[in-house]
Every structure is written in structure tokens, then in C-alpha cells.
Interface confidence: low
Amino acid sequence: PEPPTACREKQYLINSQCCSLCQPGQKLVSDCTEFTETECLPCGESEFLDTWNRETHCHQHKYCDPNLGLRVQQKGTSETDTICTCEEGWHCTSEACESCVLHRSCSPGFGVKQIATGVSDTICEPCPVGFFSNVSSAFEKCHPWTSCETKDLVVQQAGTNKTDVVCGPQDRLRA
């Protein structure tokens, strides 16, 4: 018979013959022949292969280096790589999460719009009129100015984006 030129899914062509690929979690030991099936072996501990494959070596699991601020988010299996994330207060510098940097703080005059996560940095926003932030923080939002009126007081000093208003007693009319 004419040798195949196209193999089905999960097969590969070798020596004019279609052989089965090794399933995820296993590596190729030997190609199939006219008389034998493809021979595959499971990946060892700390190794993985995540696709149907004909790889002769499994990949090493990623190492989450604590010196780079990394820790294990999800332990790898024979079919999946280890997923690293960053220690509290830090976030990944890339999608691959190969290293971490400290979450940025929002300066006075700016508040936290979105608190940082393991993969994204703090998002700051300028405090709008009526709000202030007098600290550098990775958590604090802009606070509304104190309402002097509700305390039966009057504004003695206007607020800014960095300072609260200063309230004081109302002037009494002297007789």
C-alpha cells in the first residue's frame, strides 16, 4: 500500500508511517514500527509535558525563587508547569512571573484607585476637588473633606488635594 502522507490527530509521521503521540505527562522512548506501538514513559518528579508530544525529554518544573520574591501558587504535575506568584506586597514584572517588584505607593495628593494584586501594580488616581490624601500609601483611597456644616462649624482653612479642611467655631455676634 501507498505510505500515508497525512496522519490523524494525536499521531505523527515517521519513516512513512503514522505513530501515536505520547500523551501529556509522558515522553517518547521509541517510535512505533510496523509491528510495535509507540513507546512512552511517564515524566519524573519535578518534570512535565503539557501536550500530546514526541519529546524525548520532559521539561523541568519552573523554580519559584524566593530570592526574587517568588513563591509557589500552584504546584506542577506531570502535565502542568508550576505556577509562581509574588510574596505579599509584591507583584510580577511580566506575565511569565519570573521576578517581582514592590507594589508602588500613591503619593500625597493621590489615592489608590485599584489595590495591587500578585500580577498587577497599584493604580493611583489624583484626588478630585472635595477629596484629599495626606499620606504615601499602597492602600489608602482619597478621603472626602470633613463637612464642617454637619458639625455646626465653619471652614477656617480650605482643603487641598493633600490636606483636609480646617473647621472652627462660628463667630458669635457681640451685643
Epitope: T5, R8, E9, K10, T51, W52
Partner: antibody
Amino acid sequence: VQLQESGPDLVKPSQSLSLTCTVTGYSITSDYSWHWIRQFPGNKLEWMGYIYYSGSTNYNPSLKSRISITRDTSKNQFFLQLNSVTTEDSATYFCARFYYGYSFFDYWGQGTTLTVSS
Amino acid sequence: QIVLTQSPAFMSASPGEKVTMTCSASSSVSYMHWYQQKSGTSPKRWIYDTSKLASGVPARFSGSGSGTSYSLTISSMEAEDAATYYCQQWSSNPLTFGAGTKLEIK
């Protein structure tokens, strides 16, 4: 890995069409199968055929009498030739790599639009 | 050849809405694969081996099915999901695609 199609924008009916796919970032003789797919006006996709890294080919039976896929390994290019074209062959032509490990086309060119008209 | 029929051909969904589209094969297939295509771009790998998400695909997407009946589901529609989705099989030659489901945002 990047794929880039090139060829004429316009071909006359009954002539032959020749398109080139230039691959960068991966050798077409290393592994995988390298395909041509076209998309007609109205967006229907049709698989045309492929050349395997070993050089063997496989074509859609609907095109078998008119199609040829070849390659130039020194330039890391593969080619589509379609004979006796008609207006029905007007389409956007894509080249793509099929990754059997995931069973999908993992890299595509941006496509080249061909019009068949006299 | 195996014919893949996608339905509906067109649908629109509001943000947050659950969306399901189907792909029916004329004969049984082992796996179904899905691509997303936005206007003026090439198709992107989206779901492979029926239910596995390609790299970078949001977790709100899922795929399921077996035999002749397969589906793609979005748990909560977002504006960026508006696109045309194609199913594809290669359990038998020739490789075939469905005609696509065009999904728009309301």
C-alpha cells in the same frame, strides 16, 4: 514564529496563482505541518492543504487536481500554486502552522487578498 | 467529508450575559477546536481538544461536547468577546471548518 504571505493582488481567470509564505523564527524542516487556508468573501474558511516538515504533502480532495504545495528550504519558504483559477477562487489566503501537540493552527500569517477578474 | 454546522449564525448578547453557541458534526469526531476572528485579522487559536483554553484566553470561556455535538460557552459576555467563532475538526480528512457564529455586543 512569524508567517508572511506574498503574491499578486489580481489574477485573470484561467491563469495560475502562485503565493509564497515566508517563515521566520522557526525552520520549516524542523517539525510540524505548514498549511494554506483561504477565506472567501462572506467569511467561510476552507483548508487547502499542507506540506509536512519532511516534504510530503496532503491536499483537500476538492482541489486535488489544481493544487500544488512546494517549498524552498534554503529560504525557509513554502508555496501555493493553484491552476485554472476562476472568480470563485477570489479570497483571502492565509498560511499557518499546525501544532499537533495542541491539535490547532498556532501561528497564522496576516493573509493576502486575491481577486480573480478579467 | 465531515460537515460542521454552527448555530446560530448570528447572535448578540448584553454585557454579563451567558452565551452558548454550538457546532454539530455530520459524523462523529474525536476533538473539536475553536478559533476567534475579529474583523481584518487572522483567526486566533481559542479552544483546543474540545475543552482546553489556549494560552491567554479568559477563564470565562469554556468548551464541551463529544461525538457529533460540541459547544462554546462564555459565562459572562464582555465587549472584547464580540467576534466570529469558528469550529474545526481534523478527526478525518479533509480538515474542515464550520461557517462561523458572529457574536455582537448589545
